[in-house]
């Protein structure tokens, strides 16, 4: 009852002729345990006895031994894992045919076929390919043989056209109750060079002697692979020769359907066939040039030919870094040529005439100077000739005024408070002139660019400046006017003494100025309009108070005269002509009132008195005037008065009072 | 006719400051393409250019020296001046003054015309 | 810094060609170098003989020309004379310096 058996094994077994089988065996019964196992060699059912007939391989019994059983046949299962593994080593081709499990357990019987392939020689393994192959795309290649065995060693190895292929392959068996095989892959990118070539998976034994092999030929797709020609076979020519470019497929697959021609990256118009001709070439068609055929793969492009049209220099241009430039500044100047090939020489010419000595692209002035303004042309040299040297360039060289003078256009001399007019000269600038810029700065006019009118000129004003401006400022030298003026700040300065004058003293008196042009003068001393001297000094040997007075000293050049203010000449002195005066006479009646008044001449004025009699007798009174009220007759007598001033003292000549008697008294009497 | 007369101290001492005049007659450093330039020469050996100033007041200097120079000029003195900061026994030479111009008619400097030079010693 | 290298003697004859050369550490002397070339005679009286490569200054004998020899400045004295018996300085100029050669000593065999 095949329901109560499950038997599992790979069904067929392949191997050949010296070569061994192994195979994998598993079972299962429902009701008890394997009892006797018998392998046949093509049984038959005898129906008459009820029994298989056959060749019996192996044979196990209940006790397990193996009575009459070939040695290259063993059984490597066991009844305990349900194991029904077997090999035969070596296996004949005569071993063809079925091998019959005939499994008998307590309550049942089953006979299991498998199916033994044993070929004379060693049979092929098989090379599996993915159904596409294209340039570039990694696939796996397998090679798959239906053997493996313990007993017999076997390799798989890959070649290409014959050669041993580098990359590693992973070889695997099986060796399971599903399958029976020897499989080898290999990792491979197929280039559009191995479209066509045969790759075959050898079976080596043991030895590495080849056993069998299989072949496939790729069929690898790809883009178009090309190369272009060029006839000539120079790509160097020259402006009107001919040239023709021919694009060789040398390989697609499939086979290729548009071709199209490209310069520099942008098709051409109407170049569609593999041949592509340029009559009398121009310079612009120097240019790097490839072809471009597609197939259903995608588009391919040659490696591109850079096609050089030679020609004599064209006329050329002068580049300048900058202009207008700076005095002092960095020019360059580039000669721009177009030639091909590049001109190897160049002449630089600056207002026609060749600059010496410069024959490069570049020609550098390391510091402009005005005389390098001009036009600068050039003319490039290459193995074609000369080119037509271009109308050139002109270079402006700016640079601050030069030269800058100042002219006083007056006639000299200059005196103070004329007008005076003075012009601003320069010899050459670039830019010109458009401003004019005077030192010191005053409110001065400026009728016309560059000339300054000063009106009224001080007597100060010594130097004047001027400067020309355009982008810049260049100033002159000062010029001195040398304004003439009458002397200024005249004054009287006391030389000596250096304290207060004192009557006796020595004194001089100095007729100072502050500046004079011209510088020679004269001097003069007044004194309430009388003149006293004409020295800068004037001297006393002994002042006395009548010396006091106001004193002015005048300078004089040939410009003028100057007066200096007036100056108070104070003279001290102690008190000088002291008298005593009486203002009602020197008689006076008794009981009247005496005054009598202390007159003197003094500087300071006198701030102390004093009063005496006949005997030198001090009075008690210290005022200028002594007041006798009311007189008697014995005040009469005479009188002297003293007085005092920091300077000094003085005192007055006697003086007599005489009191007489008052009609009453003598009435009295 | 163009001359330069270098003139300075002689003799000084390390970390000393060195000055050195150049008086120059027949141009003038207001006049466009002349400059001044200063080389030394050490005993028995080459030329070293220290630096130059041109009328436009660009001034260049040795890269090695620059921190330690100065140049100057007075244009209406006719002077040109240099000063070598914390001077050192290395500069020990002979210090000359040369005009560089720029010719007219011409595109590039010239060192045209030399002093005679002034010799200098660092001594401690 | 570059280093300026000149031959350090030269012996010619009245009446021969002589070349200098002048040879920059930082590669081919070009015309932005302005090569300059000085003479220096007995006493230290130095003398400018040419600038910007090719120039000769105001005043020099047609006799000493100045040019560019590969890749290096070159002073030639054609037809030498013996007064011309001198140290020859070569200096170049890198974009803010001059650098001087060590110097060539050129006797004239009388």
């Known amino acids: 009852d095949s329901s109560k058996w499950n038997i599992e094994h790979p069904g067929t077994i392949y191997a050949w002729e010296g070569a061994c089988v192994w195979v994998p065996c598993t079972y299962r019964v429902l009701d008890g345990a394997l009892e006797t196992f018998i392998l046949f060699h093509n049984p038959e059912y005898n129906q008459n006895m009820s029994k298989f007939e056959g060749t019996r391989l192996y044979e196990s019994t209940k006790d397990g031994k193996v009575p009459s059983g070939q040695k290259r046949v063993q059984f490597l299962g066991n009844k305990i894992n349900n194991n029904c593994t077997l090999s035969i080593h070596p296996v004949h081709v005569n071993d063809s045919g079925q091998l019959g499990l005939r499994m008998v357990s307590k309550t049942e019987k089953w006979m299991e076929r498998i199916h033994l392939n044993v070929s004379e020689r060693p049979f092929p393994p098989r090379i599996q390919l993915p159904p596409k192959l294209q340039e570039s795309q990694e696939v796996t290649l397998t090679c798959l043989l239906n053997f493996s065995c313990y007993g017999y060693q076997i390799q798989l190895q890959w070649l290409l056209e014959g050669v041993p292929m580098r990359q590693a392959a992973v070889t695997s068996t099986s060796l399971s109750t599903k399958s029976v095989f020897t499989r080898s892959e290999l990792k491979f990118s197929p280039q559009w060079s191995h479209h066509g070539k045969i790759v075959t998976c050898e079976l080596h034994d043991v030895d590495g002697k080849v056993l069998s092999e299989d072949m496939v030929q790729l069929n690898v797709k790809h883009t178009p692979k090309l190369t272009i020609e060029v006839t000539p076979n120079e790509t160097i020519v020259r402006k009107g020769d001919s040239v023709t470019m021919t694009c060789k497929v040398n390989s697609s697959n499939p086979e290729y359907t548009t071709v199209s021609w490209l310069k520099d990256g942008i098709p051409l118009k109407e170049q569609n066939t593999l041949m592509l001709t340029l009559h009398e070439v121009t310079k612009s068609q120097t240019g790097r040039y490839c072809c471009r055929v597609s197939n259903d793969v995608g588009p391919a492009t040659s490696e591109k030919v850079f096609l050089q049209v030679q020609y004599a220099p064209e006329p050329s241009r002068v580049q300048i870094s900058q202009s207008p430039a700076v005095e002092g500044s960095e020019v360059n100047f580039l000669c721009i040529s177009p030639a091909n090939p590049l001109p190897t020489n160049y002449t630089w010419y600056h207002n026609g005439k060749e600059v010496q000595g410069r024959t490069e692209k570049q020609f550098q002035i390391q510091k402009i100077l005005p005389w390098h303004a001009g036009t600068y042309s050039c003319e490039a040299e290459n193995i074609l000739g000369i080119g037509e040297r271009g109308p050139g360039t002109e270079l402006d060289v700016q640079y601050p005024p030069k030269k800058v003078t100042m002219v006083i256009e007056n006639p000299t001399p200059i005196r103070e408070g004329d007008t005076v007019t003075l012009s601003c000269n320069y010899s050459s600038s670039n830019p010109i002139v458009n401003h004019y810029e005077w030192r010191p700065r005053g409110a001065w006019e400026e009728p016309s660019l560059g000339v300054l009118k000063i009106q009224n000129i001080g007597w100060n004003n010594t130097a004047v400046a001027c400067a020309a401006c355009n982008n810049w400022c260049s100033w002159a030298s000062p010029v001195t006017l040398n304004v003439l003026y009458a002397p200024r700040g005249v004054r009287v300065r006391k030389i000596k003494p250096l304290s207060e004058i004192h009557s006796g003293n020595s004194v001089s008196l100095q007729c100072d100025f502050s500046s004079s042009h011209p510088k020679e003068v004269q001097f003069f001393w007044e004194k309430n309009g009388s003149l006293l001297g004409k020295e800068s000094q004037l001297n006393f040997d002994s002042i006395s108070p009548e010396d006091a007075g106001s004193y002015s000293c005048w300078v004089n050049n040939s410009i003028g005269q100057t007066a200096s203010k007036a100056w108070t000449l104070e003279v001290l002195y102690a008190p000088r002509r002291l008298r005593v005066s009486m203002s009602q006479g020197n008689q006076v009646m008794e009981g009247k009132t005496a005054t009598l008044t202390c007159e003197s001449d003094a500087n300071p004025p006198v701030y102390s008195y004093a009063w005496f009699d006949w005997n030198n007798q001090s009075l008690p009174y210290s005022g200028r005037m002594l007041r006798l009220e009311p007189v008697k007759v014995q005040h009469s007598g005479a009188y002297w008065c003293q007085g005092t001033n920091r300077v000094g003292k003085g005192h007055s000549p006697l003086i007599t009072l005489t009191v007489y008697y008052s009609p009453q008294t003598i009435g009295r009497r | 006719q163009v001359t330069l007369k270098e003139s300075g101290p002689g003799i000084l001492q390390p970390s000393q400051t060195l000055s050195l005049t150049c008086s120059f007659s027949g141009f003038s450093l207001s006049t466009s393409g002349m400059g001044v330039g200063w080389i030394r020469q050490p005993s028995g050996k080459g030329l070293e250019w220290l630096a130059h100033?041109?009328?436009?007041?660009?001034?260049y200097y040795n890269p090695a020296l620059k921190s330690r120079l100065t140049i100057s000029k007075d244009t209406s003195k006719n002077q040109v001046f240099l000063k070598i900061a914390n001077v050192d026994t290395a500069d020990t030479a002979t210090y000359y003054c040369a005009r560089i111009s720029i010719p007219y008619g011409y595109y590039d400097w010239f060192f045209d015309v030399w002093g005679t030079g002034t010799t200098v010693t660092v001594s401690a | 810094q570059a280093v300026v290298t000149q031959e350090s003697a030269l012996t010619t004859s009245p009446g021969e060609t002589v070349t200098l050369t002048c040879r920059s550490s930082t590669g081919a002397v070009t015309t932005r170098n302005y090569a300059n070339w000085v003479q220096e005679k007995p006493d230290h009286l130095f003398t400018g003989l040419i600038g910007g490569t090719n120039n000769r200054a105001p005043g020099v004998p047609a006799r000493f020309s100045g040019s560019l020899i590969g890749d290096k400045a070159a002073l030639t004295i054609t037809g030498a004379q013996t007064e011309d018996e001198a140290i020859y300085f070569c200096?170049?100029?890198?974009?803010?310096?001059?650098?001087f050669g060590s110097g060539t000593k050129v006797t004239v065999l009388g």
């Open positions: 200096a170049l100029w890198y974009s803010n310096h001059f650098i």
């Open positions: 100033i041109w009328w436009d007041d660009d001034e």
